[in-house]
């Protein structure tokens, strides 16, 4: 099996989630990228970039901003003004077409609690849960990408291809990767 280690983020309401997702460049030169939340049995795509890609520009859907670093294989994600109901499991994906996405590791477990965002917090452990997904054939991911400009929302998709540098995991049923604990 392939293990996916989740990183847990704890925030107070009103704060901003700020994470990065690394990706291999060459294969996805003109691909869209998306930010999705696991809801129920399906991932829900909250925001995604559109083709054709141009120089790096932040793109925004509501409280979500995606910004790509085209020369460095890095997608920056911000979710502002966090609310308790935002808690859940999130993933960056390379969105290639409606039936296929490439999930970028690591999954993000977001826990938002009520209270002042100015309240001092204590330290937290970054790695909380370990996922196991079916082992599959591996494909190399290459290096080069140009960045997106605009963002649209899309309905949930049913099939994902999980990717990490050096391998891809093909899942025909997305429930294979979301039947895991979200909270500790």
């Amino acid at each position: 099996t392939t293990e996916l280690t989740e990183e847990k983020y704890e925030y107070k309401e009103g704060q901003t989630l700020e994470v990065k997702c690394d990706y291999a460049l060459e294969k996805y030169a003109n691909s869209r990228k998306a930010w999705q939340k696991m809801e129920g049995k399906m991932p829900k795509i909250l925001a995604k970039t559109e083709r054709p890609s141009e120089n790096s520009h932040p793109v925004q859907v509501g409280r979500i901003t995606l910004e790509d670093y085209p020369d460095h294989g890095l997608l920056q994600v911000r979710m502002t003004n966090l609310q308790v109901e935002d808690s859940g499991l999130y993933q960056c994906v390379i969105y290639q077409h409606p039936k296929e996405s490439h999930v970028l590791f690591n999954p993000i477990c977001l826990v938002v609690t009520k209270g002042s965002s100015g309240t001092p917090g204590s330290s937290e452990n970054s790695t909380q849960n370990v996922y196991r997904t079916p082992s599959t054939t591996a494909k190399a991911l290459g290096p080069r990408y140009t960045s997106p400009r605009t963002v649209t929302q899309a309905p949930p998709e049913s099939t994902v291809v999980v990717s990490t540098p050096g391998s891809e995991i093909n899942l025909t049923n997305v429930t294979d990767i979301i039947r895991v604990p979200v909270f500790n």
């Epitope: 291999a24 790096s56 460095h72 993000i108 309240t119 917090g121 970054s126």
Partner: antibody, heavy 121, light 105 residues
Framework: QVQLVQSGAEVKKPGASVKVSCKAS????????IHWVRQAPGQGLEWMGW????????NYAQKFQGWVTMTRDTSISTAYMELSRLTSDDTAVYYC??????????????WGQGTLVTVSS | SYELTQPPSVSVSPGQTASITCSGD??????VCWYQLKPGQSPILVIY???KRPSGIPERFSGSKSGNTAILTISGTQAMDEADYYC????????FGGGTKLTVL
């Protein structure tokens, strides 16, 4: 435990280059960005750029583009920062630092001990 | 380019509370962290994600934000807290504030 150990102090002449190393241990080297930060005498901290050890790609602060190069040797878990065309203004302590998490760029939780580079004729 | 502004110096008497500010455009929508730097030593992360303390950092260090200003507060300041303090955020590139010298009188 996580450790970043840097190479020793260097004295260089103006116009020369310097290459500082940062050997990582206690974690998976490929999983976390390495950043380079410097502090010149009497000045503040200045971010120079980051290196993605997994891909070898680097992102440099605009000020340093064209005369800094960040590389790595994954076989020995070591990152390098080379600064060329040195001037006296480059006299500083140079630090390497590591991201706190795989999914963030900041903060820098782990730091090397610093390498003093002195540029003098 | 993105800039973070800090006061050059702050003075405080032992046992009193010191507050160091850091201001920047849209800082309210950025994660802010703070570092302590003493002469001859490497920087130490004291606050990250606006208000979280890494393990080993005393409880007297706390962080908060008001609008586009982040605040590092040191309550019951001790002589050992005398140092330079830097805020940091990420906006396309990593940015440090200019630093604040904390003097414990």
């Amino acid at each position: 435990q996580v450790q970043l150990v840097q190479s020793g102090a260097e004295v260089k002449k103006p116009g020369a280059s310097v290459k500082v190393s940062c050997k990582a241990s206690g974690y998976t080297f490929n999983g976390y960005y390495i950043h380079w930060v410097r502090q010149a005498p009497g000045q503040g901290l200045e971010w120079m750029g980051w290196l993605n050890p997994n891909s070898g790609g680097a992102n440099y602060a605009q000020k340093f583009q064209g005369w800094v190069t960040m590389t790595r040797d994954t076989s020995i878990s070591t990152a390098y920062m080379e600064l060329s065309r040195l001037t006296s203004d480059d006299t500083a302590v140079y630090y390497c630092a590591r991201d706190q998490r795989k999914t963030t760029v900041t903060p820098f939780e782990y730091w090397g001990q610093g390498t003093l580079v002195t540029v003098s004729s | 380019s993105y800039e973070l502004t800090q006061p050059p110096s702050v003075s405080v008497s032992p046992g009193q509370t010191a507050s160091i500010t850091c201001s920047g455009d849209k800082l309210g929508e950025r994660n802010v962290c703070w570092y302590q730097l003493k002469p001859g030593q490497s920087p130490i992360l004291v606050i990250y994600q606006d208000n979280k303390r890494p393990s080993g950092i005393p409880e007297r260090f706390s962080g908060s934000k008001s609008g586009n200003t982040a605040i590092l507060t040191i309550s019951g300041t001790q002589a050992m807290d005398e140092a330079d303090y830097y805020c940091q955020a990420w906006d396309r590139n990593v940015v440090f504030g200019g630093g604040t010298k904390l003097t414990v009188l």
